[in-house]
Interface confidence: low
């Protein structure tokens, strides 16, 4: 399927609107500090060039690869050295090394100001004045803050963003209509970004075998009526799509994703009965719908797994003949029978099964050796079941904020070297598992909770890789993708940690605390809590609770005072002294 001009091929396949959007996303994800106008200029130049290639595929430079074309364009940015430092050295390299270099410089935590939401009337005016620019600005701002955001999915978010403004800017109460929609898009967007970051980490750090195993398990849960060969085909195609997007090949990724959606809709009968309503939708919506589709019903008459994978005398023969196919089939068969298990648990079970076969197929009596393999799965299954049960009980008892605080303390004690902002961000997100998963029926709790925790812990791993400070974090993040969560769960208080010296500055608060939103107030308090634990890692729950209760009372008192700043100046040092005494 070779084309004389790759850029013309993609422009024709995707259409101008999607082509321009994806190029803007690609450039914004690579050059995250560049101003919006600079990116728009580059995109327009690339688009005009693509059009000349559509008109004549033999025109000059039209035969160049997309990496060459895009890389050459990025390297024309005048301020590359001043803005990006050593990233400018990428431009001295040839493809494919130049693109690899750009990828390595993507920053998961760019030093960009938080997005401030203007007044609704201001946003509506901007939307009506220049809708195209308004939507491009959205793509740019999200892409530069989330350099691994799944690009075709970001186009879908932009379409929803546009629809929200088109509807609400005509409404009687614009704010009541628009703000909940924007909140929903923000929260869904952050979740989508984090999920995609795990897919890219899986591919980049553990290889496509790890990603394919994840995909076999997940798709087998979703499509339990599909044949293994059908699931295998979907896995191969999905792996290609995500490899491309994670590698910055956004045009190819979006094109292949559209092809995959087309294939799934043309072959619904052999995939799932749940695809019908997705397949009537327009492209972006259809692809999103297919990705989020609920699990199909399990076939009623599935036989016991034991016959083929334990009792059969041919287990070692089948395993030796084609290891990955046999293990893939085992994973498929197990996953389609267990929508109640997390994908990570299913992968641990497949890993345990593989280890048993490696050992037993070399033994004198292989069948005798692997006969009890399913019994060995029990502790692996019970561990996440118990973890979910205990943490949901704690969540129900404490509520979200205090549950987050419990996790903040737990994780700060485990890995106190990690920066306070990272511990606060990660623990707050870990704490959101309660509201997200604990309300679900028993059969959906574990897949919801553990697979969500894997996404959140990947964020910790990604941030820690940028600035490594803890050998324990490095070990949990790099040794095994499927065992990351159990690895972190198993960490105890770090006895080797030297407590942080007390710094009164850290616990000095001002009247601006009173004007913060509830969420911002929580973050301030939680930041203080982390610092307290870093100062006194062996403080008991009761001691920490006492200090935090005093802190809340002190803030509440001063925010009610006439002269707030004077109150903070007077009461602050008393609070610090009382806290030090309580923790002594």
């Amino acid at each position: 399927d070779t084309h004389k001009s790759e850029v013309a091929h993609r422009f024709k396949d995707l259409g101008e609107e999607h082509f321009k959007g994806l190029v803007l996303v690609a450039f914004s994800q690579y050059l995250q500090q560049c101003p919006f106008e600079e990116h728009v200029k580059l995109v327009n130049e690339v688009t005009e060039f693509a059009k000349t290639c559509v008109a004549d595929e033999s025109a000059e430079n039209c035969d160049k690869s997309l990496h060459t074309l895009f890389g050459d364009k990025l390297c024309t940015v005048a301020t590359l050295r001043e803005t990006y430092g050593e990233m400018a050295d990428c431009c001295a390299k040839q493809e494919p090394e130049r693109n690899e270099c750009f990828l390595q410089h993507k920053d998961d935590n760019p030093n960009l100001p938080p997005l401030v939401r203007p007044e609704v009337d201001v946003m509506c005016t901007a939307f009506h004045d220049n809708e195209a620019t308004f939507l491009k600005k959205y793509l740019y701002e999200v892409a530069r803050r989330h350099p691994y955001f799944y690009a075709p999915e970001l186009l879908f978010f932009a379409a929803r963003y546009k629809a929200a403004f088109a509807e609400c800017c005509q409404a009687a109460d614009k704010a009541a209509c628009l703000l909940p929609k924007l909140d929903e898009l923000r929260d869904e967007g952050k979740a989508s970004s984090a999920k995609q970051r795990l897919k890219c980490a899986s591919l980049q750090k553990f290889g496509d075998r790890a990603f394919k195993a994840w995909a076999v398990a997940r798709l087998s849960q979703k499509f339990p009526k599909a044949e293994f060969a059908e699931v295998s085909k979907l896995v191969t195609d999905l792996t290609k799509v995500h490899t491309e997007c994670c590698h910055g090949d956004l045009l190819e990724c979006a094109d292949d994703r559209a092809d995959l959606a087309k294939y799934m809709c043309e072959n619904q009968d052999s995939i799932s009965s749940k695809l019908k309503e997705c397949c009537d939708k327009p492209l972006l919506e259809k692809s999103h719908c297919l990705a989020e589709v609920e699990n199909d019903e399990m076939p009623a008459d599935l036989p016991s797994l034991a016959a083929d994978y334990v009792e059969s005398k041919d287990v070692c023969k089948n395993y030796a003949e084609a290891k990955d196919v046999f293990l893939g089939m085992f994973l498929y068969e197990y996953a389609r029978r267990h929508p109640d298990y997390s994908v990570m648990l299913l992968l641990r079970l497949a890993k345990a099964y593989e280890a048993t076969l490696e050992k037993c197929c070399a033994a004198a009596d292989p069948h005798e050796c692997y006969a009890k393999v399913f019994d060995e799965f029990q502790p692996l299954v019970e561990e996440p079941q118990n973890l979910v049960k205990q943490n949901c009980e704690l969540f129900e008892q404490l509520g979200e904020y205090k549950f987050q605080n419990a996790l903040l303390v737990r994780y700060t004690k485990k890995v106190p070297q990690v920066s306070t902002p990272t511990l606060v961000e990660v623990s707050r997100n870990l704490g959101k598992v309660g509201a997200k998963c604990c309300k679900l029926p028993e059969a959906k709790r574990m897949p919801c909770a553990e697979d969500y925790l894997s996404v959140v812990l990947n964020r910790l791993c990604v941030l820690h890789e940028k600035t490594p400070v803890s050998e324990k974090v490095t070990k949990c993040c790099t040794e095994s993708l499927v065992n990351r969560r159990p690895c972190f769960s198993a960490l105890e208080l770090d006895e080797a940690y030297v407590p942080k010296a007390f710094n009164a500055e850290t616990f000095t608060f001002h009247a601006d605390m009173c004007t913060l939103s509830e969420k911002e107030k929580q973050v301030k308090k939680q930041t203080a809590l982390v610092e307290l634990v870093k100062h006194k890692p062996k403080a008991t729950k009761e001691q920490l609770k006492g200090v935090m209760d005093n802190f809340a009372a002190f803030v509440e008192k001063c925010c009610k005072a006439d002269d707030k700043e004077a109150c903070f100046a007077e009461e602050g040092p008393k609070f610090v002294a009382a806290s030090q005494a309580a923790l002594a």
């Epitope: 599909a226 044949e227 293994f228 060969a229 059908e230 295998s232 085909k233 294939y263 072959n267 009968d269 052999s270 083929d308 089948n318 003949e321 084609a322 196919v325 046999f326 089939m329």
Partner: nanobody, 115 residues
Framework: QVQLVESGGGLVQPGGSLRLSCAAS????????MSWVRQAPGKGPEWVSA????????RYSDSVKGRFAISRDNAKKTLYLQMNSLKPEDTAAYYC????????GSQGTQVTVSS
């Protein structure tokens, strides 16, 4: 690497017979259901027939029911399609696939029914 190689196609007169074979390698053949699919010039792929892993359950599209018979030999890792009472509309490239997929995983073998 999974490989499927079809053979047995050719030119045959209407009412004639052919037997297609599909030799499989690179996977545990005896654990998979298999299908025959065909694609006529200028048309999309059409599922023809399927057989389960053990060979006990066979299925056919309405257009070939009663004329074609699917079978397998797991020891030889080979899938067969016996085609009788062939008609001009059976003219197509025939290829075998794992499971019920209609996605082409092989070159196929050409069957032409013409007088």
């Amino acid at each position: 690497q999974v490989q499927l190689v079809e053979s047995g196609g050719g030119l045959v007169q209407p009412g004639g017979s052919l037997r297609l074979s599909c030799a499989a390698s690179g996977f545990t053949f005896g654990s998979f259901g298999m299908s025959w699919v065909r694609q006529a010039p200028g048309k999309g792929p059409e599922w023809v027939s399927a057989i389960d892993s053990g060979g006990g359950d066979t299925r056919y599209s309405d257009s070939v029911k009663g004329r074609f018979a699917i079978s397998r030999d797991n020891a030889k890792k080979t899938l067969y399609l016996q085609m009788n009472s062939l008609k001009p509309e059976d003219t197509a490239a025939y290829y075998c696939t794992i499971g019920r997929s209609t996605s082409r995983g092989s070159q196929g073998t050409q069957v032409t029914v013409s007088s």
